[in-house]
């Protein structure tokens, strides 16, 4: 019995769902009577589910698994794998036995897109040219482990005093930190770029350093200018500094974050003490380092309705404000692939293809191209769809008349993580059917 | 049964280049974190390298630029290049499989080490 | 990086005696990436206890991992034969990977 899964392992985001594609051809005549189908790890050999005496036996993995019931009796024994996890990733085998037997593997690859990364400025205040400074870059929940990359403005890769740490937390994610030191010139941009391996994500940030001295007079309060990008569901830190002169104390200082826009009240620090959050529970200063003028907010579990400008009043004696912008952002995920009609091809068909990648945010572009990478424009429709989270499912359509083979590529682009999710698909050979049947 | 075969130690001199091989069977190679890990003649153990299943490699620093990981996962075999070898290089070295998250990662699996010298 | 300091370097037991090794570090390490390993003379390390307290297949029963933080330890609560080994602890929560420099644990 041939059984048939993918050769190239199956990519799977942390927390979406992933589809095990397993098939094999009955014969007329097959009944779900005669079939014994059982998903297992191919390592340890751990029962996942199981089909047998014409039933479902049900998920033995955790509760997370899931056949497809009505697919069965066409040969279809692929496995549904629920809210996965970095502990899922690995080879699952697939035994399929009607009278005679036969069983293949899949591979699943666990995958999660890295934030855009953070940027600190060690010293950050009073940088005079030939000062070295620390520039720390920090991107958040990845996995697996990330490359990091650092450039100067013209692009020249900077390779010499660059530490760079991975830290796993309790899902099995990383966080990478990595530190470049350098040594100041009149002015000067710095870049990272954080790349997961599987995804092929790169998430980028830069700082330009402008060395001088900082002017006098009112509070000077300083924020990043880029905004702050943050994913769904993480938290956020939204910078803002000041100053202290000597002899500062946290009675002195009044503290107000509030939106820039509705100038609805976020949070505020008044009095000597922290007065707590007005912004849905969810915000926190960090007291231990007001004191030395760390202004910053701490945004947690952020929703896409958060995104916007936050305002940063401080007042000692005198008084100063500026304005921290947030970007939200949501990875989409690795686009599907749909063909109609599917079967029976043949050249001069004309074939709808459907590209579908879900709950990003901000909206996608879509981008599709042929073979050669000669970008594929007339013909294509897309939609972005808004859930209720505010989170878009994207789906293109492209219109092709078909050649004798041919290769079409959809890239579902993030415009602020500048993350590129890619599917494919080959129509070749005449007449076929996809996708393509044992 | 779990076996993890290095293979290509042996006595080379100062500024010399080494090829470390190690065949693995008993497990689905390609779906596993890869590393080597040595042991000095103190035995102190310190990881060298690691290698993701599609290929992406980490290395630690003492070595970076002068090892190369890699892995054929059609054959099951997992590589480290040496070159500019220096006598602090001289260890025991032992291909590892990296475990996944369910056991946290720990380093489940080690094989018999081959051993590499560099003296003039 | 993170420094792994296990004390002691070299310690000798009498067969049926309770045993207790420590493991230090530098900076604080996520009790679930903290792991112990094993080896004798001649042979390669063997995993032995993962995640702080978690025994790996067929490591007896009388052995007992805990700790949190920066200190971590592993116990054995009546010394046999078989235990005299070399123990290594181990951290996977912040590259680079780092090793203890092993305690030696003897018969007396």
């Known amino acids: 019995l041939e059984v048939q899964v993918p050769e190239d392992p199956v990519v799977a985001l942390v927390g979406t769902d992933a589809t095990l594609c397993c098939s094999f051809s009955p014969e007329p005549g097959f009944s779900l009577a005669q079939l014994n189908l059982i998903w297992q790890l191919t390592d340890t050999k751990q029962l996942v589910h199981s089909f047998a005496e014409g039933q479902d036996q049900g998920s033995a993995y955790a509760n997370r698994t899931a056949l497809f019931p009505d697919l069965l009796a066409q040969g279809n024994a692929s496995l549904r794998l629920q809210r996965v996890r970095v502990a899922d990733e690995g080879s699952f085998t697939c035994f399929v036995s009607i009278r005679d037997f036969g069983s293949a593997a899949v591979s699943l690859q666990v995958a999660a897109p890295y934030s855009k990364p953070s940027m600190t400025l060690e010293p950050n205040k009073d940088l005079r040219p030939g000062d070295t400074v620390t520039i720390t870059c920090s991107s958040y929940q990845g996995y697996p482990e990330a490359e990091v990359f650092w450039q100067d403005g013209q692009g020249v890769p900077l390779t010499g005093n660059v530490t760079t740490s991975q830290m796993a937390n309790e899902q099995g994610l990383f966080d990478v930190h990595s530190i470049l030191r350098v040594v100041l010139g009149a002015n000067g941009t710095y870049s990272c770029l954080v790349r997961n391996p599987v995804l092929q994500q790169d998430a980028h940030s830069s700082v330009t350093i402008t060395p001088q001295r900082s002017p006098t007079g009112a509070v000077e309060v300083q924020v990043p200018e880029d905004p702050v990008v943050a994913l769904v569901g993480t938290d956020a830190t939204l910078r803002c500094s000041f100053s202290p002169e000597p002899g500062f104390s946290l009675a002195q200082l009044n503290l107000i974050w509030q939106l820039t826009d509705t100038k609805q009240l976020v949070h505020s620090f008044t009095e000597g003490r922290d007065q707590g959050s007005a912004y849905a529970n969810r915000t926190a200063l960090f007291p231990d380092l007001l004191a030395q003028g760390n202004a910053s907010l701490r945004l947690q579990r952020v929703r896409v309705a958060d995104e916007g400008s936050f305002t940063c009043f401080v007042s000692i004696r005198d008084f100063g404000s500026a304005a921290v912008s947030l970007q939200v952002a949501a990875p989409y995920s690795k686009p599907s692939m749909t063909l109609e009609p599917n079967k029976d091809l043949r050249p001069g068909d004309t074939v709808t293809i459907t590209c579908s990648s879900y709950r990003g945010y901000p909206e996608a572009e879509v981008f599709w191209q042929d073979g050669q990478g000669v970008p594929l424009t007339g013909n294509v429709t897309t939609s972005q769809m808004a859930n209720e989270q505010g989170l878009f499912d994207v789906h293109s359509v492209l219109r092709v008349v078909l050649g004798a083979n041919g290769t079409y590529s959809c890239l579902v682009r993030n415009p602020v993580l500048q993350q590129d999710a890619h599917g494919s698909v080959t129509i070749t050979g005449q007449p076929m059917t996809f996708p393509p049947e044992a | 049964e779990v076996t993890l075969v290095e293979s290509g130690g042996g006595l080379v001199k100062p500024g010399g280049s080494l090829k470390l091989s190690c065949a693995a069977s008993?497990?689905?190679?390609?779906?596993?974190?890869m590393s080597w890990v040595r042991q000095t003649p103190e035995k102190r153990l310190e990881w060298v390298a690691s290698i993701l299943s599609g290929g992406t490699s980490f290395y630690a620093d003492n070595v970076k630029g002068r090892f190369t990981i890699s892995r054929e996962n059609a054959r099951n075999i997992l590589y480290l290049q040496m070159s500019s070898l220096k006598s602090e290089d001289t260890a025991m070295y032992y291909c590892?499989?990296?475990?996944?998250?369910?056991?946290?990662?720990?380093?489940?699996?080690w094989g018999q080490g081959t051993s590499v010298t560099v003296s003039s | 990086q993170i420094v792994l300091t296990q004390s002691p370097a070299n310690m000798s037991a009498s067969l049926g005696e309770r045993v207790t090794m420590t493991c230090a570090a530098s900076s604080s390490v996520s009790s679930s990436y903290l792991h112990w390993y094993q080896q004798k003379p001649g042979s390669s390390p063997k995993l032995w206890i993962y995640s702080t307290s978690n025994l790996a297949s067929g490591v007896p029963g009388r052995f007992n991992g805990s700790g949190s933080g920066t200190s971590y330890s592993l116990t054995i609560s009546s010394m046999e034969a078989e235990d005299a080994a070399t123990y290594y602890c181990?951290?996977?929560?912040?590259?680079?990977?780092?090793f203890g420099g092993g305690t030696k644990l003897e018969i007396k």
């Open positions: 008993g497990f689905t190679f390609s779906t596993y974190v």
């Open positions: 181990h951290q996977y929560h912040r590259s680079p990977w780092t």
């Open positions: 590892v499989r990296r475990y996944g998250h369910d056991r946290y990662y720990a380093m489940d699996y």
